[in-house]
């Protein structure tokens, strides 16, 4: 673990001084620190055309430290690197560069994208969604009774949000038209007083939805379903069979 004596030839500057500044153990007027006090790191700083030795508690930005048995030494990282593990492996790049597998790059390779927060090249993350949840009950205006046609919805969750270059999420909500067996509203399910009362026999061509009583008919004239002729009804039946899908939420 000790340094081998045979190959060591320490060339000291003539003006070697023991009365050194700061953490220097030995120094010279011309070269600054030549060696450091225990636990301090020796680094060479370029000042103009000459290099000056300095002693530091840790290596500065752009350098990495090696604790040899006889000296703690700072070694320069590559030019584009701010923090490195050693000469080969950068761990943080200088501004304007992106870190990828220990190297600093101007641009991230194909299939990767730049994370401008960490300044690293990262894998492109595509959106991932869960399976659809079951369809909700068929409802109209929030009620599940007293009508024939309504809408039902289903949702799915986003499992993985996409990164900047990732594929966008598909819709997470789907709504479609639905039909239900005509079901009389129970007392607690009634809408506005007296409006949900069912007529004895709906006329041919009327919808099976609950319709207002005769008094309200006078004021409202006809409800839309009563206005439909037979051709329109046929058209509607075909559309219902196709259960057209409309999308409400996109991420």
């Amino acid at each position: 673990q000790n340094a081998s004596r045979g190959r060591r030839q320490r060339r000291m500057h003539p003006n070697v001084s023991q009365g050194c500044q700061g953490g220097c153990a030995t120094c010279s007027d011309y070269n600054g620190c030549l060696s450091c006090k225990p636990r301090l790191f020796f680094a060479l700083e370029r000042i103009g055309m000459k290099q000056i030795g300095v002693c530091l508690s840790s290596c500065p930005s752009g350098y990495y430290g090696t604790r040899y048995p006889d000296i703690n030494k700072c070694t320069k990282c590559k030019a584009d690197c701010d923090t490195c593990f050693n000469k080969n492996f950068c761990t943080k790049c200088k501004s304007g560069f992106y870190l990828h597998l220990g190297k600093c790059l101007d641009n991230c390779p194909e299939g990767l994208e730049a994370n401008n927060h960490t300044m690293e090249c990262v894998s492109i993350v595509h959106c991932e969604v869960s399976e659809w949840n079951p369809w909700s009950p068929c409802t109209k205006k929030g009620k599940t009774c007293g009508f024939k046609r309504g809408t039902e919805t289903r949702v799915r969750e986003i499992i993985q949000h996409p990164s900047a270059k990732g594929n966008l999420c598909p819709p997470t909500n789907e709504t479609r038209k639905c039909t239900v067996q005509r079901k009389k509203c129970q007392k607690g399910e009634r809408g506005k007083k007296g409006r949900e009362r069912k007529r004895k026999k709906p006329n041919k061509g009327e919808s099976k939805e609950a319709i207002p009583d005769s008094k309200s008919l006078e004021s409202s004239k006809e409800i839309p379903e009563q206005r439909e002729n037979k051709q329109q009804q046929k058209k509607r039946k075909v559309q219902d069979k196709q259960k057209s899908v409309s999308v409400s939420t996109v991420h």
Epitope: Q1, S4, R7, R8, T66, P69, K87, N88
Partner: antibody, heavy 116, light 107 residues
Amino acid sequence: EVQLVESGGGVVQPGRSLRLSCAASGFTFSDYDMAWVRQAPGKGLEWVATIIYDGSRAYFGDSVRGRFTISRDNSKNTLYLQMNSLRAEDTAVYYCTAHDRSFDYWGQGTMVTVSS
Amino acid sequence: DIQMTQSPSSLSASVGDRVTITCLVSEDISNDFVWYQQKPGKAPKLLIYAASRLQDGVPSRFSGSGSGTDFTLTISSLQPEDFATYYCQQSYKYPPTFGQGTKLEIK
């Protein structure tokens, strides 16, 4: 492509000497501290010695200090390990490696067997 | 010298398994820590440096974690080519020291 090619291994009697060489290519040899790491048959890895990039300082593991010397010739991109007073326990595969805190590049190894 | 205690010394697992190898260090070494993989008859290969950074060409199923004295190598889903011996090494100070190795075998 980085290449480290060891040579000089073989069978040698206890007390005798052997010199291993390692020819480097594919990287700037003179920028790197170089080391020898060995592995006895069926055992783990053991650091043997390191010489710094310019050859001015060298460091040795306790088990070889005083018997082994490490040297380099940067003009030839070659690393050496001079092994004297060899013992049975020095029997191992000897790997030449670029040592910069971690051992980044490795040779394929050369087998040294110390046996009477 | 800094002591490295690697465990387990051997481990049997199946393809697809998640495997964890640990290394305990006798003093705080921050993240100055490396993992190697060695296959029979071959030289060791550097897998992870600075405790958690993957070397170029190493599959993303390998990951390293830890800082200070406790370090972990995880293989998320073992592949046939991952059966090998794994070594940890501290790069904090001289002399460089290795763990005794973990031999990962097929169950």
